[in-house]
Interface confidence: low
Amino acid sequence: LQSQGVSLYIPQATINATVKEDILLSVEYSCHGVPTIEWTYSSNWGTQKIVEWKPGTQANISQSHKDRVCTFDNGSIQLFSVGVRDSGYYVITVTERLGSSQFGTIVLHVSEILYEDLH
């Protein structure tokens, strides 16, 4: 995806996971200068910001995801020990200063490990 000088690549737009897995929401971006990266989470319960940061600086992680997420300078984030309630839409927005911006979405499906699946 490209817009106004920001390009954003999402290698896997849908991720299926089971509870307690650590999940990488993987992206790649390119732009002029150092952007601001913002991840938000949307579900039937509403939308909330997860984290915002400029690569190379400390990330501002929301209270709801403290100790549950880590960031990478390529824009990716990792979610630790996911639960079913983490299922939903994860939207990344990469913004160059006060202008150029691009967004992309990853859909995460988290399911319980069923007893039958183990046999």
């Epitope: 490209q2 817009s3 601001t36 200063r97 006060l98 202008g99 911006s101």
Partner: antibody, heavy 121, light 112 residues
Framework: EVQLVESGGGLVQPGRSLRLSCAAS????????MHWVRQAPGKGLEWVAV????????YYADSVKGRFTISRDNSKNTLYLQMNSLRAEDTAVYYC??????????????WGQGTLVTVSS | QPVLTQSSSASASLGASVKLTCSLS???????IAWHQQQPEKGPRYLMK???????SKGDGIPDRFSGSSSGAERYLTISSLQSEDEADYYC?????????FGGGTKLTVLG
């Protein structure tokens, strides 16, 4: 529920000043960039100015640069537009709008109902 | 700076579908845009943000009847099962480094 309520519009003579306010509620005001957009009678929408979430970055349309100043008071959840040296062509309904993001000026996911500014002698 | 071009008017019958077009200027075909609706005597309302690949994210409470798509430098807003309250002005908007640009708007009339 997100609400943006503009005030401060009215009739003003050319060359005079006016300050518009926008009271925000229903979201974390200090986390988002904010815009002013205007609409002259019977015309389309025209972007006026944007300010980043912390007030550190401001941008203006060429038509108002040097005359208008956008500012915000995060402790009061209020956005302002100081309009100086007003001209007849500044006559419009002025809308305050919330950006979807905090630093980037992208698009607006909520709008106010607007306040009418009429510049006439 | 990008320029957005919209037809000044469009019309369609109640219950039918209509497709509104927003054209990006040469050299800006990769830009994302947004669509906003303005009903008579009201403030604008955000409908959706639309990427160059057609992916889009809609605003709160926007019905499924509204959808977006893209082809080259064209950005589309499709409204299906038209209702009387869809009669409104529709604006596309885009953004760049420190600037915001609106199209001229399309006035949609819902017939009969």
């Amino acid at each position: 529920e997100v609400q943006l309520v503009e005030s401060g519009g009215g009739l003003v003579q050319p060359g005079r000043s006016l300050r518009l306010s926008c009271a925000a509620s229903g979201f974390t005001f200090s986390s988002y960039a904010m815009h002013w957009v205007r609409q002259a009678p019977g015309k389309g929408l025209e972007w006026v100015a944007v300010i980043s979430y912390d007030g550190s970055n401001k941008y203006y349309a060429d038509s108002v640069k040097g005359r208008f100043t956008i500012s915000r008071d995060n402790s009061k959840n209020t956005l302002y537009l100081q309009m100086n040296s007003l001209r007849a062509e500044d006559t419009a309904v002025y809308y305050c709008a919330k950006d979807q993001y905090s630093v980037g000026a992208t698009t607006y996911d909520y709008w106010g109902q607007g306040t009418l500014v009429t510049v006439s002698s | 700076q990008p320029v957005l071009t919209q037809s000044s008017s469009a019309s369609a019958s109640l219950g039918a579908s209509v497709k509104l077009t927003c054209s990006l200027s040469s050299g800006h075909s990769s830009y994302a845009i947004a669509w906003h609706q303005q009903q008579p005597e009201k403030g604008p309302r955000y409908l959706m943000k639309l990427n160059s690949d057609g992916s889009h994210s809609k605003g709160d409470g926007i019905p499924d009847r509204f959808s977006g798509s893209s082809s080259g430098a064209e950005r589309y807003l499709t409204i299906s099962s038209l209702q009387s309250e869809d009669e409104a002005d529709y604006y596309c908007q885009t953004w760049g480094s420190g600037i915001q640009v609106f199209g001229g708007g399309t006035k949609l009339t819902v017939l009969g």
